[in-house]
């Protein structure tokens, strides 16, 4: 039975320009995680394996930063990235857990930034 | 230039082990995955497992699970793949390959090492 | 385990002939695919990753395509120097697999 949950930071926003880090935590199970994978919709943007270390799509290699932990540093944030961004949890033996962050990136100076996972 | 030299070729018997080595030069050996792949006469690609240099971690193939023993020597920049329990379906060409910085993709290979397991 | 289900197995073509080759994951992988050449008694090489990007020096006249579970691989118009057998992999989770490979040969 898969006991655990994912916590996330929720909806976050961040200014244009800025930076910002996606992070997820899985509590409640003593399953080992093998992979955290973040997503788009349709696309990969990086793989956190956890013997193989760190894979970065192309299209997102210069302003994806790794970490800190498991979690994913967004860079040169752009409107364009304001939507849901998943982190998916692969784990023994449990399987998959999945959790979601809504991004919004403002034109605006005045963001109300995430609490404790924004970068200053 | 990214280079990987793989031993040559061996031949054991049924039920031994075989120990191949993958020297790396022209890069920063703690920076790329390594990939051990093999390949069966007329057969496609299969992958055994990878290591991260870095830290030592490893991962398989469950096929490959118990039976393979992926090292790195950070001294030599050298990968090893160890191979034990062998049977005649073992008999590959197995290959090392290397992937890049923050990349799962087999940007580098070496040039293959056969491995005949024959009585 | 992921399965990669390449199409055709084997393909007949002559000089400047168009060819596509098909992959087929068994989950949805995102764009987490390569397409490797091989040559016979020679090492696999890298071509196409995730799953758009051409390799550093391989010709133009390579591209792929896809996302999610169906993945494209095609020579705009084919060289002598292209038979060959290409493979496609995944490598969104481990173990990472490969198609079973498909053999461009000459007509």
């Known amino acids: 039975m898969m006991t655990g949950t994912i916590e996330t930071t929720g909806n976050i926003s961040a200014e244009k320009g800025g930076s910002i880090i996606l992070q997820c935590h899985l509590s409640s199970t003593t399953a080992q995680v093998t992979q955290v994978n973040w997503e788009q919709q349709d696309q990969l943007l990086a793989i956190c394996n956890a013997d193989l270390g760190w894979h970065i799509s192309p299209s997102f290699k210069d302003r994806v930063a790794p970490g800190p932990g498991l979690g994913l540093t967004l860079q040169s944030l752009t409107v364009n990235d304001t939507g849901e961004y998943f982190c998916i949890y692969h784990t023994y033996p449990d399987g998959t857990y999945t959790g979601r962050i809504f991004l919004e990136v403002l034109e605006s100076s005045v963001a109300e930034h995430g609490a404790r996972f924004q970068i200053p | 230039q990214v280079q990987l030299v793989q031993s040559g070729a061996e031949v054991k018997k049924p039920g031994a082990s075989v120990k191949i080595s993958c020297k790396t030069s022209?890069?920063?050996?703690?920076?790329?995955?390594l990939h051990w792949v093999r390949q069966a006469p007329g057969q496609g690609l299969e992958w055994i497992g990878g290591i991260n240099p870095n830290n030592g971690g490893t991962s398989y193939a469950q096929k490959f699970q118990g039976r393979a023993t992926l090292t790195v020597d950070t001294s030599t920049s050298t990968a090893y793949m160890e191979l034990s329990s062998l049977r005649s379906e073992d008999t590959a060409v197995y290959y090392c390959a290397g992937s890049g910085y923050y990349d799962y993709s087999f940007a580098y290979w070496g040039q293959g090492t056969l491995v005949t397991v024959s009585s | 385990d992921i399965q990669m289900t390449q199409s055709p197995s084997s393909l007949s073509a002559s000089v400047g002939d168009r060819v596509t080759i098909t992959c087929r994951a068994s989950q949805d992988v995102k764009n987490a695919v390569v397409w490797y050449q091989q040559k016979p008694g020679k090492a696999p090489k890298l071509l196409i990753y995730s799953p758009s990007y051409r390799y550093t020096g391989v010709p133009s006249r390579f591209s792929g395509s896809g996302s999610g579970t169906d993945f494209t691989f095609t020579i705009s118009s084919v060289q002598p120097e292209d038979f060959a057998t290409y493979y496609c992999q995944q490598h969104y989770s481990t173990p990472f697999t490969f198609g079973q490979g498909t053999k461009l040969e000459i007509k």
């Open positions: 022209g890069y920063t050996f703690t920076e790329y995955t």
